[in-house]
């Protein structure tokens, strides 16, 4: 029963041109070349795109048009390989443009970089950049998909197209504003720190898709759609997975014309559906097309159905659950998990794939026993431990959280984690620890109900960070196992490792802890981040460093740049100070 | 709305067949194990069978052999196929749904009943 | 098959009486048990199911209990709309079901 229209196109060029309209249609192309090709100039891509447009415009003029018949892999990689510096500018990525589709585009997907070689994006003064934004508002708002496309490869494109509209009328109000900082940043504000959480929850998708698969991604979404939209029945939970997936996948494979187009046929349905699917979704509809996909994607759960049995007498108690299984073994588990996970908006979809997981390891030894059915009847004692650890981690946790505020919260995460994995590039540690440290003023406030959900698969988002970036320059077999063996069981592999006894800890270097003037006139963000870098540091040259000794040297850390900052010679200061600094750091710690 | 609707009922001769359909409206019957239960005039309740949503049917007992359940998703339509039918087989015929895809009980939603007689 | 064996098969009450109803397995079925009532020409109601649990909707006076092999439904204060004929339904234990006879619950 999907929603997508099959039918066949003489030129796909000039359908999704169609569908989409000329505005969305440059724009997703746009993004899709900035994914691509991460470092080229903003001039190089909007002259790409343009003739990319104007090529699909004669192909709407008459469909059988020379090379419109051409599949979009095929028109769009053809684009790419006309950059004049691509082998000087990519290298190797130079070489998928000897290759045909579909092995090219396979190639470019490849090369994507997750952490590409750009300058921070640096915020210019408001007046300057509504005078940017007044000046050529369409280029403006092109910039701003370009430089977020191509610093996040793998963002959902149609979720960007939504980001850029509330840019420009960010910018729309505030430049008119009689105060337009005040009116301006805070939104800016808000849309970064949305847009990266947007962007690390699409990375998780696209993992999930390209290295563990189709399955492992609708079983997610079976079980997020089922705790979603409890009162749908499975075929209409089994019917959106599939379009989902579909939607992901494609989006996740840079074909970002169909995923949005898909996107948007999907919101479609579930919104002339939302009887049968959710009651929560119609305010959602009542939105425009982009605001309507963005809502229902974050739509509430919708109550659990009255008078829902229990799931014993079905998958547990019944001597035929080892026929029901053989005989139909994906609509079975399929059926478990979409029952365990409507029954349960308090675990977290991790869990719940967890225990789905479980459920089946027993019914595929039990039902090669003597007596299944004595084999397999205790199977739900098996979830008790399984639900338990989770739990127990975040009551643990939020209390750490609560006792120590934020950043003192992430910096405990900073030294567990450094002594779990020391091997880690400091940045890669720092930015995860960080993030993981953000649990706790995100979901610590919720009531038990919802803590879990929220803290665990957002534990699994900032997770994955860590193993993309470590798949780009792997230098630790723990990080590799554990993001590698099974994709539900990150956050718990991660959560169990110990100390790493076989490291041998950094060589003091006393240059690592200088620190200068400039530190003065950092934000406070920015100056927590020096401070935790310095921490992780700390940690990889003296790794049995007890939390006392760290504690006391951090707090002299902080003295001393609050001294210095305050101080009429700043440099001076830090000079004489950082050297003092330096040496009782390392008495301290026996260095 | 959701309601399930029997049909085919009527009257048949000792040893003919009959075929009952349930037809599904307001939900799809792919997600339910459905169930063909029968009412004797003036007796209890029997179960016939059922359809999972594995598409693995089971009977009762005494129902094996003689009748078949089965299903078009397409149609949204259950059926319940009687041969050899007999006088005793005379009742009143209700398709019932499970609770989930796997369900033998218990039954929420019931349809009006279709009758059959068998005499000649 | 689970054999389902309710009793009475019939009884007699006046409203506002207390009414209970028995339902014994053949064998164990945890709390596999569903109480239905029943009304000429009409198709059964769902009251009670998993022994203890009320459906939606059905008033707070019927009440179910038991687990295993022996159930009780029972009705607190009789109600005119509540004479019909209730049946037991032990389910869960396999794919197949069975019903009780039922009892016919008439005005005294």
């Known amino acids: 029963r999907g929603v997508f229209r099959r039918d066949a196109h003489k030129s796909e060029v000039a359908h999704r041109f169609k569908d989409l309209g000329e505005e969305n249609f440059k724009a997703l192309v746009l993004i899709a070349f900035a994914q691509y090709l991460q470092q080229c100039p903003f001039e190089d891509h909007v002259k790409l795109v343009n003739e990319v447009t104007e090529f699909a415009k004669t192909c709407v003029a008459d469909e059988s048009a020379e090379n419109c018949d051409k599949s979009l892999h095929t028109l769009f990689g053809d684009k790419l390989c006309t950059v004049a510096t691509l082998r000087e500018t990519y290298g190797e990525m130079a070489d998928c443009c000897a290759k045909q589709e579909p092995e090219r585009n396979e190639c470019f997907l490849q090369h994507k970089d997750d952490n590409p070689n750009l300058p921070r994006l640096v915020r210019p003064e408001v007046d300057v950049m509504c005078t940017a934004f007044h000046d050529n508002e369409e280029t403006f708002l092109k910039k701003y998909l370009y430089e977020i496309a191509r610093r996040h490869p793998y963002f959902y494109a149609p979720e960007l197209l939504f980001f850029a509209k509330r840019y420009k009328a960010a910018f729309t109000e505030c430049c008119q504003a009689a105060d337009k900082a005040a009116c301006l940043l805070p939104k800016l504000d808000e849309l970064r720190d949305e847009g990266k959480a947007s962007s690390a929850k699409q990375r998780l998708k696209c993992a999930s898709l390209q290295k563990f698969g189709e399955r492992a991604f609708k079983a997610w979404a079976v079980a997020r759609l089922s705790q979603r939209f409890p009162k749908a029945e499975f075929a209409e939970v089994s019917k959106l997975v599939t379009d989902l997936t579909k939607v992901h996948t494609e989006c996740c494979h840079g074909d970002l014309l169909e995923c949005a187009d898909d996107r948007a046929d999907l919101a479609k349905y579930i919104c002339e559906n939302q009887d049968s699917i959710s009651s929560k979704l119609k305010e959602c509809c009542e939105k425009p097309l982009l605001e309507k996909s963005h809502c229902i994607a974050e739509v509430e759960n919708d109550e659990m159905p009255a008078d829902l049995p229990s799931l014993a007498a079905d998958f547990v108690e019944s001597k035929d659950v080892c026929k029901n299984y053989a005989e139909a073994k994906d609509v079975f588990l399929g059926m478990f998990l979409y029952e365990y996970a409507r029954r349960h908006p308090d675990y977290s979809v991790v869990l719940l794939l967890r225990l789905a997981k479980t459920y089946e390891t027993t019914l595929e030894k039990c039902c090669a026993a003597a007596d299944p059915h004595e084999c397999y009847a205790k199977v739900f004692d098996e979830f008790k431990p399984l639900v338990e650890e989770p739990q127990n981690l975040i009551k643990q946790n939020c209390e750490l959280f609560e006792q120590l505020g934020e950043y003192k919260f992430q910096n405990a995460l900073l030294v567990r984690y450094t002594k779990k994995v020391p091997q880690v590039s400091t940045p890669t540690l720092v930015e995860v620890s960080r993030n993981l440290g953000k649990v706790g003023s995100k979901c610590c406030k919720h009531p038990e109900a919802k803590r879990m959900p929220c803290a665990e698969d957002y534990l699994s988002v900032v997770l994955n960070q860590l193993c993309v970036l470590h798949e780009k320059t792997p230098v630790s077999d723990r990080v590799t196992k554990c993001c590698t063996e099974s994709l539900v069981n990150r956050r718990p592999c991660f959560s169990a490792l110990e100390v790493d006894e076989t490291y041998v800890p950094k060589e003091f270097n006393a240059e690592t802890f200088t620190f200068h003037a400039d530190i003065c006139t950092l934000s406070e963000k920015e100056r927590q981040i020096k401070k935790q870098t310095a921490l992780v540091e700390l940690v990889k040259h003296k790794p049995k460093a007890t939390k006392e000794q760290l504690k006391a040297v951090m707090d002299d850390f902080a003295a001393f740049v609050e001294k210095c900052c305050k101080a009429d010679d700043k440099e001076t200061c830090f000079a004489e100070e950082g050297k003092k600094l330096v040496a009782a750091s390392q008495a301290a710690l026996g260095l | 709305e959701v309601q399930l609707v029997e049909s085919g009922g009527g009257r048949v001769q000792p040893g003919g067949s009959l075929r009952l359909s349930c037809a599904a409206s307001g939900f799809s019957l792919s997600s339910y194990a459905m169930n063909w239960v029968r009412q004797a005039p003036g007796k209890g309740l029997e179960w016939i069978g059922h359809?999972?949503?594995?598409?693995?049917?089971y009977y009762a007992t005494w129902a094996k052999g003689r009748f078949t359940i089965s299903r078009d998703n397409s149609k949204n339509t259950v059926y319940l196929q009687m041969n050899s039918l007999r006088a005793e087989d005379t009742a009143t015929y209700y398709c019932?749904?499970?609770?989930?895809?796997?369900?033998?009980?218990?039954?929420?939603?019931w349809g009006q009943g279709t009758q059959v007689t068998v005499s000649s | 098959d689970i054999q389902m064996t309710q009793s009475p098969s019939s009884l007699s009450a006046s409203v506002g009486d207390r009414v209970t109803i028995t339902c014994q397995a053949s064998e164990s079925i945890n709390s596999r048990l569903a109480w239905y009532q029943q009304k000429p020409g009409k198709a059964p109601k769902l009251l009670i199911y998993d022994a203890s649990d009320l459906t939606s909707g059905v008033p707070s006076r019927f009440s179910g209990s038991g687990s295993g092999t022996d159930f009780t439904l029972t009705i607190s204060s009789l109600q005119p709309e509540d004479f019909a004929t209730y049946y037991c339904?032990?389910?869960?234990?396999?794919?197949?079901?069975?019903f009780g006879g039922g009892t016919k619950l008439t005005v005294l």
């Open positions: 339904q032990g389910y869960g234990g396999s794919s197949t079901t069975t």
């Open positions: 019932a749904r499970g609770a989930g895809g796997f369900s033998t009980g218990p039954f929420k939603l």
């Open positions: 359809i999972n949503a594995g598409d693995i049917a």
